[in-house]
């Protein structure tokens, strides 16, 4: 895909920069596995630049490719309390809305760790709603160091 | 925030680029938990290019939002040596000075593993020191593909 | 490493952008610890723009500094299938390729987890090819959410 | 419990070629946590270290030894071997292979030792 | 290459007694550094790992303590099966080197 002619002479912003890193607010209720997300530099180091929230989850608005990364770290929590459940706590996200797009783009269980970190490269578009669904009944930790999500613009 | 008229006109490098590998040196003497780290194309893939290092910690010399990543790998080391202490060993990312900036960018612990892998995106300002903490008496590998942290300069 | 004028003149595309998100496709026969990739917007979310495939391994085709990640989860997994073995389960990245640049770039082992994520900066040259080792005898899950391998070009 | 044994000539005339093979038992070498390494020992004198081997092939050697040794890794047999070329007099030790962790050089599983002597 | 400096070379002691043997390095090691011990016909055997770490089935009257390029190993109350050769390693850079051995015999 290559840049058109009106890209490569608008100035660099015009191509993307679209960027967040956000900080967890709450969970959802229950029957809710979703993770509730907020950002903003009031807030600490958590900033949106492009994308925005819709009731605590992350929108694209403009459309490439993304880094996506995220941590979470369980609250209370040993080896023996992840393990001891039957199903482990697992993290996904995933593309939630629009329906017709939506897909997992990440996932990771816990086992016997108390905190997931991983990241991916994926084509993102205008209107995508980024989900994080924690299944279980460990709760995240809410510390902004621990648990946090983001997104980066890389290329068209 | 936007990028200025003088910005858009600069050649690309002006905007940042910068970008640093470190791999681990040392670690600190007793009552020291920080990791001393190196970096340059004589000791092998590391490098520095914009970021400095003071007495083995990371000076940033460019404001804007970076993506900050770290593995740490611990050198002697089982599932049960890392369960059998009562504090897990746990390692932090963070400004250290200016003491008015100082604070916790990334946390993990290890619990019953041997590596921690993480990233975010945080904003950080010229003359920020990261410093990253391995709390507990496990000493961490030395090996450059298992131990590194680096830094990249996303965006202004 | 400054950017030459004719760089800096030159449209955005050709200072890079080169990047690529790969899923497995299988894994080698035996005593050949290799994982084969694949990537393509007909198999799904991944793709190549700008490095190859040769034989599922990945080739890069331009010079710079890439910031190369996976993740990698075990297909039948539990914390007591990982600890029961002798040897933890590994997963290493490195150039296998031309044989004198030959290097571990990034290794994990699993021990109680199921799944490894990383990432890291390190320079590659036009040529290299990179080979994901993964030894034991766990099998990694094709899942395109829990097993995937990219790279993004960042600076020349 | 993992075992090592070295296996190879006892006597070797100087100016040849030293070639030792260590082979593992009850653990693979085909592990991404091990180096497999030389060790020797003059008579009466102390440890140095020769090199070591990784599974796939990737070594390190003792740069006083490097112009002169050779390793190779045989998956399919779990053994690895150790060739020094020209040898003289002051090459005769007792040769032990052992393992090491791959994060960290910890000497932890060793051969019983094999005596090599170099006399024509 | 790191040299490793043993020291004394060789000591003769009683059983019960406290034996304290001093390893030196070239150049700082942190805390990548281990200690064996090699009787007649035998391989070495590890004793200490990470300067102070006691090796999983070693007696506690085994100690070792220091970092960067002094290093001490002790042991508390010399025992019949302690007569042997004891030897320092470094873990912190290629080539590994280990130091010339120090021989604790029977006074």
């Known amino acids: 895909q290559r840049l058109s002619r009106a890209q490569q002479q608008l100035p660099l912003e015009s191509l993307g920069w679209d960027i967040a890193e956000l900080q967890l607010n709450h969970t959802g209720p229950q029957q809710d596995p979703r993770l509730y997300w907020q950002g903003g530099p009031a807030l600490g180091r958590s900033f949106l630049r492009g994308p925005e929230l819709d009731k605590g989850q992350l929108r694209i608005r403009r459309d490439g490719i993304y880094m996506v990364h995220i941590q979470v770290t369980l609250a209370i929590c040993s080896s023996t309390s992840t393990s001891r459940h039957h199903h482990p706590t697992t993290l996904a996200v995933g593309i939630c809305s629009p329906a017709s797009r939506s897909i997992s783009l990440l996932r990771l269980s816990f086992h016997q760790g108390c905190t997931i970190a991983s990241q991916r490269l994926t084509p993102l578009a205008r209107g995508d709603t980024l989900c994080t669904n924690l299944t279980g009944t460990l709760l995240p930790s809410r510390n902004t160091d621990e648990t946090f999500f983001g997104v980066q613009w890389v290329r068209p | 925030q936007r990028l200025s008229r003088a910005q858009q006109q600069l050649p690309l490098e002006s905007l940042g680029w910068d970008i640093a590998e470190l791999q681990l040196n040392h670690t600190g003497p007793q009552q020291d938990p920080r990791l001393y780290w190196q970096g340059g194309p004589a000791l092998g893939r590391s490098f520095l290019r914009g970021p400095e290092l003071d007495k083995g910690q990371l000076r940033i010399r460019r404001d804007g939002i970076y993506m900050v990543h770290i593995q740490v790998t611990l050198a002697i080391c089982s599932s049960t040596s890392t369960s059998r202490h009562h504090h897990p060993t746990t390692l932090a990312v963070g400004i250290c000075s200016p003491a008015s900036r100082s604070i916790s960018l990334l946390r993990l612990s290890f619990h019953q593993g041997c590596t921690i892998a993480s990233q975010r995106l945080t904003p950080l300002a010229r003359g920020d020191t990261l410093c990253t903490n391995l709390t507990g008496t496990l000493l961490p590998s030395r090996n450059t593909d298992e131990t590194f942290f680096g830094v990249q300069w996303v965006r202004p | 490493q400054r950017l030459s004028r004719a760089q800096q003149q030159l449209p955005l595309e050709s200072l890079g952008w080169d990047i690529a998100e790969l899923q497995l496709n299988h894994t080698g026969p035996q005593q050949d610890p290799r994982l084969y990739w694949q990537g393509g917007p007909a198999l799904g979310r991944s793709f190549l723009r700008g490095p190859e495939l040769d034989k599922g391994q990945l080739r890069i085709r331009r010079d710079g500094i890439y910031m190369v990640h996976i993740q990698v989860t075990l297909a039948i997994c539990s914390s007591t299938s990982t600890s029961r073995h002798h040897h933890p389960t590994t997963l290493a990245v490195g150039i296998c390729s031309p044989a004198s640049r030959s290097i571990s770039l990034l290794r994990l082992s699993f021990h109680q987890g199921c799944t490894i994520a990383s990432q890291r900066l390190t320079p590659l040259a036009r040529g290299d090819t990179l080979c994901t080792n993964l030894t034991g005898t766990l099998l990694p899950s094709r899942n395109t959410d829990e097993t995937f391998f990219g790279v993004q070009w960042v600076r020349p | 419990q993992m075992q090592l044994q070295e296996s190879g000539p006892g006597l070797v005339k100087p100016s040849q070629t030293l070639s030792l093979t260590c082979t593992v038992s009850?653990?693979?070498?085909?592990?991404?946590?091990?180096?497999w390494s030389w060790i020797r020992q003059h008579p009466g004198k102390g440890l140095e270290w020769i090199g070591y081997i990784y599974y796939s092939g990737s070594t390190s050697y003792n740069p006083s030894l490097k112009s002169r040794l050779t390793m190779s890794v045989d998956t399919s047999k779990n053994q690895f071997s150790l060739k020094l070329s020209s040898v003289t007099a002051a090459d005769t030790a007792v040769y032990y292979c052992a393992r090491s962790g791959y994060s960290y050089a910890l000497f932890d599983y060793w051969g019983q030792g094999t005596l090599v002597t170099v006399s024509s | 290459d790191i040299q490793m400096t043993q020291s004394p070379s060789s000591l003769s002691a009683s059983l019960g007694d406290r034996v304290t043997i001093t390893c030196r390095a070239s150049?700082?090691?942190?805390?990548?550094f281990n200690w064996y011990q090699q009787k007649p016909g035998k391989a070495p055997k590890v004793l200490i790992f990470a300067a102070s770490s006691l090796q999983s089935g070693v007696p506690s009257r085994f100690g070792g303590s220091g970092s960067g390029t002094d290093f001490t190993l002790t042991i508390s109350s010399l025992q019949p099966e302690d007569f042997a050769t004891y030897y320092c390693q470094q873990s912190y850079s290629t080539p590994w080197t280990f130091g010339q051995g120090t021989k604790v015999e029977v006074k």
């Open positions: 009850d653990g693979s070498i085909i592990s991404g946590v091990y180096y």
């Open positions: 150049q700082s090691v942190d805390r990548y």
